[in-house]
């Protein structure tokens, strides 16, 4: 019997009946065994077929077989109900070998020409399986010449049998307080030949509870306990299971914070598996009772390990732990069933005793010493000499712990000295220099420091004076000896003040005329206002109406008198304002340089002379009565004049204060 060619030679060829294409003889038996390489099969088809037809091909036939299986027995020329001829059919070996047997019997009724066939080896596609047959591979099948291989989806690994995909289902750790876990692919069938390990690991103090949910289907056996596939649950205390079959296992209360779930499957079966919903519990903490004027959030039926609550206080109350304020409060339940911090209090906001008001007082309105939320206090200023600036003095204790005015201000009100009060009333006529009486000029300030000069008190910590009077001390403010509240220049009874800083107008040039002859002295402490020490008012916008030509102003000071000496007692003189052009003309002639009198100056005095300010009065105030407010204000600052004070046809020249209101206000607000 001839054999087919041996691989690796090409496996293909031709087969024919003996004597083909002539008729075949009787009593012939011929056998061919064709062999292909592993992973290949043989394909065979006939190009000519002419054999004696007999019932079930008993006489002459060609038989094709592969291994023990007969693929076909062929005879005749065309197929009938009971006999088969190859026609155009192609035949395939089942493995890599194909046996072909030709036989003729002892007689033929007529001549038959036999057969001619061709064969070739071809790759087997192992990945193609007939319907109803098990697939070659669990997941993916890859055919190649001479063979195939299997691969798996993500999350699986190829078993050593090279066909099954085992699930990579170990090492998952669940740390949340509740969750779900299930067999791989649930609710689809779970994979074969897999060993899965799941861990639930919660903080110490928690106890895991397992509930099997939805469905449970694990391969079982009627007599033996879970011999094929099984589920086991292990804690540090005990083991539960194995579980299999179709009945949902009961709830398992593990009383453990760690659980290991093992699921093992064999190579066969088609079951949907299982799903577990797990929860946890722990020793509950005492139910938190909110402190008075507070509330707990969130509200829960019970609080267990890791649960927390916060306390929020009502408006006007603040969290206190002991006496210490807390920004927020959150307590956490511990594993021993206790809270990690003690409950705070919601204590009513206490604004505390209100600050003392300089030159004022405070009165408790709500009740004596009551300083808690919504309490009301009333500030007021010392009558007569102080007045409250901006607000009405009513303050309420607000939720932020601050005393707050009706305008929302948290700063204290200010008791501002009342300005321009004088014991003196003007007679409205000109008369000679007079001795001042107590309270006549309570703004009068005596400035000693090299020379004698004067100034006027503004507010309770500023002195308005002439630049030329303090120019030498501008860099040594502390050298100025400032006295007030006295009439007698040499009296030991006076209120002492010291300078913190001297501010000379930037437009003033020393020894080059007296334009911008104005300065401010900041005192290092506020002075106490009384009938003998009261500030002068600054001019209002409307003040010019009280400072027209011939309106009377009053100058005061300890300057030279007609006798040529500094006055012992404070003196004053009432003098009229002089027409500006008239004054300018008076100082146009020598020895005065042109332009001595500027728009920043005003003049006052008598044309006939005799009433004037003089050396030593420098820096003092020329004051006017504002008849609308009934307050005295400073209209001029004693600046300069003729060499001979009180000279006829010459006038005292004063710095025009109204021109400097913005400058004064800026300095005072900035410093």
């Amino acid at each position: 019997t001839p054999l087919g060619p041996k691989w690796p030679e090409p496996v293909f060829g031709r087969l024919a009946s003996p004597g083909f294409p002539g008729e075949y003889a009787n009593d012939q038996e011929r056998r061919w065994t064709l062999t292909a390489p592993p992973g290949y099969r043989l394909r065979l088809y006939f190009t000519h077929f002419d054999l004696e037809l007999s019932h079930l091909c008993e006489y002459d036939f060609v038989k094709l077989s592969s291994g023990a299986k007969v693929l076909a027995t062929l005879c005749g020329q065309e197929s009938t109900d009971t006999e088969r001829a190859p026609g155009k059919d192609t035949f395939y070996s089942l493995g890599s070998s194909l046996d072909i047997t030709f036989r003729s019997d002892y007689s033929n009724e007529k001549p038959f020409t036999g057969f001619e066939a061709f064969y070739a080896a071809e790759d087997i596609d192992e990945c193609q399986v007939a319907p109803g047959e098990a697939p070659t591979c669990d997941h993916h099948c890859h055919n190649h010449l001479g063979g195939f291989y299997c691969s798996c989806r993500a999350g699986y690994v190829l078993h050593r049998n090279k066909r099954t995909c085992s699930a990579l289902c170990s090492g998952q750790v669940f740390t949340q307080r509740s969750g779900e876990l299930s067999s791989p692919e649930y609710p689809r069938p779970y994979p074969k030949l897999s060993s899965c390990t799941y861990s639930i690991s919660l903080e110490e103090g928690f106890s895991v509870i397992l509930d099997f949910v939805e469905s449970f289907d694990v391969e079982t056996h009627p007599e033996t306990l879970c011999p094929y596939d099984f589920l086991k649950i292990q804690t540090d205390r005990e083991e539960h299971g194995p579980f299999c079959g179709k009945t949902l296992p009961h709830r398992i209360e593990t009383k453990s914070n760690t659980v290991t779930i093992t699921f093992v499957t064999d190579e066969s079966g088609d079951h949907t598996g299982w799903k577990i919903h797990y929860t946890s519990t722990a020793q509950p903490c005492p139910y938190p009772m909110a402190p008075p004027n507070g509330h707990v959030s969130p509200v829960q039926a019970k609080y267990i390990l890791k649960d927390s609550f916060s306390i929020f206080c009502e408006t006007g109350y603040e969290l206190l732990q002991g006496h210490l304020p807390l920004k927020s409060f959150t307590a956490v339940c511990q594993k021993d069933g206790s809270w990690d911090r003690p409950m705070p209090a919601c204590s009513i906001v206490d604004c505390g005793p209100p600050d003392d008001l300089p030159s004022g007082r405070v009165e408790y309105i709500t009740g004596p010493g009551v300083t808690t939320y919504k309490a009301v206090i009333q500030y007021s200023c010392e009558e007569t000499f102080y007045t409250m600036k901006v607000n009405d003095g009513k303050y309420v204790c607000e939720a932020d712990g601050f005393w707050t005015s009706s305008k929302g201000e948290k700063s204290l009100p200010v008791c501002e000295p009342v300005c321009g009060l004088s014991a003196r009333t003007t007679g409205g006529r000109i008369y000679g220099g007079q001795k001042a009486k107590p309270g006549d000029f309570p703004w009068q300030v005596l400035i000693l420091g090299g020379t004698t000069a004067a100034g006027a008190l503004l507010y309770d910590n500023w002195v308005l004076t002439a630049a030329h009077a303090v120019y030498e001390q501008k860099h040594d403010a502390s050298a100025l000896d400032i006295r007030m509240g006295t009439l007698k220049r040499l009296s030991p009874h006076y209120t002492q003040a010291w300078s913190e800083a001297v501010f000379i107008h930037e437009g003033y040039t020393h020894d080059a005329g007296f334009d911008n002859d104005i300065a401010l002295i900041k005192l290092n402490n506020k002075v106490v206002i009384n009938s003998n020490i009261t500030p002068i008012c600054l001019p209002r916008k409307e003040a010019e109406s009280f400072m027209r030509t011939d309106d009377i102003g009053t100058a005061s000071g300890w300057g030279l008198t007609q006798r040529g000496f500094l006055a012992r007692n404070l003196m004053y003189v009432d003098i009229p304002i002089v027409d500006h052009q008239k004054c300018t003309a008076a100082y146009e002639k020598p020895p005065y340089p042109r332009g001595s009198v500027t728009a920043n100056m005003l003049c006052a005095g008598l044309e006939s002379g005799g009433k004037d300010s003089c050396r030593g009065d420098s820096g003092g105030a020329l004051v006017f009565l504002d008849s609308e407010t009934e307050r005295w204000f400073v209209g001029g600052i004693v600046s300069w004049g003729s060499m001979n004070c009180g000279e006829a046809g010459q006038y005292g020249v004063y710095t025009k204060v109204i021109n400097y209101i913005p400058w004064i206000e800026n300095i005072i607000s900035d410093f």
Partner: antibody, heavy 118, light 106 residues
Amino acid sequence: QVQLQESGPGLVKPSETLSLTCTVSGGSISSSSYYWGWIRQPPGKGLEWIGSIYYSGSTYYNPSLKSRVTISVDTSKNQFSLKLSSVTAADTAVYYCARDRRGRFDPWGQGTMVTVSS
Amino acid sequence: SYELMQPPSMSVSPGQTASITCSGDKLGDIYAYWYQQKPGQSPVLVIYQDNKRPSGIPERFSGSNSGNTATLTISGTQAMDEADYYCQAWESSTGVFGGGTKLTVL
């Protein structure tokens, strides 16, 4: 305005007990609004809270000093006191008393220097 | 034990803004307090409960506190602001001070 004044010996021997008193004027030590505290400051160094007391006698102490510190109050004299036992040179400091209103120290006393030396 | 960290020193020109920091673990969850101490003088409270200013303290002093850092800000710094500044907080009912920052006004 409330004022505080510390008093006590300026020199203490090692291993002895340091005793200081703080006298409160211009306000009552029995006010429910306040605790009263002690703070110290070693030369050239920072501040260290020692402890605070309420007029009822309730106290808070710095854990690092707790074993050696006693703070007491005498409401009749409007005073509170500090005792620090087993002193060493490390306890040399300016000791301040202060009013403690809900955790904020205001005002403070002028401070008293205590030297620990033999 | 709880610690508050401050830079030992910093300098600022007059009129400029000085920002002094104080850091501690979750400091923003608790209140911070700030004290000013001039040489030879007792400390003075300048800011309490993070951002509140006691009466008598100029408006140029302000405070903030979040995360791990509290900040004292002095805007328009003046020569008189030259001093040591200490932050303070209460942690578990224990008073803790920072090491202090020496502010120099150039």
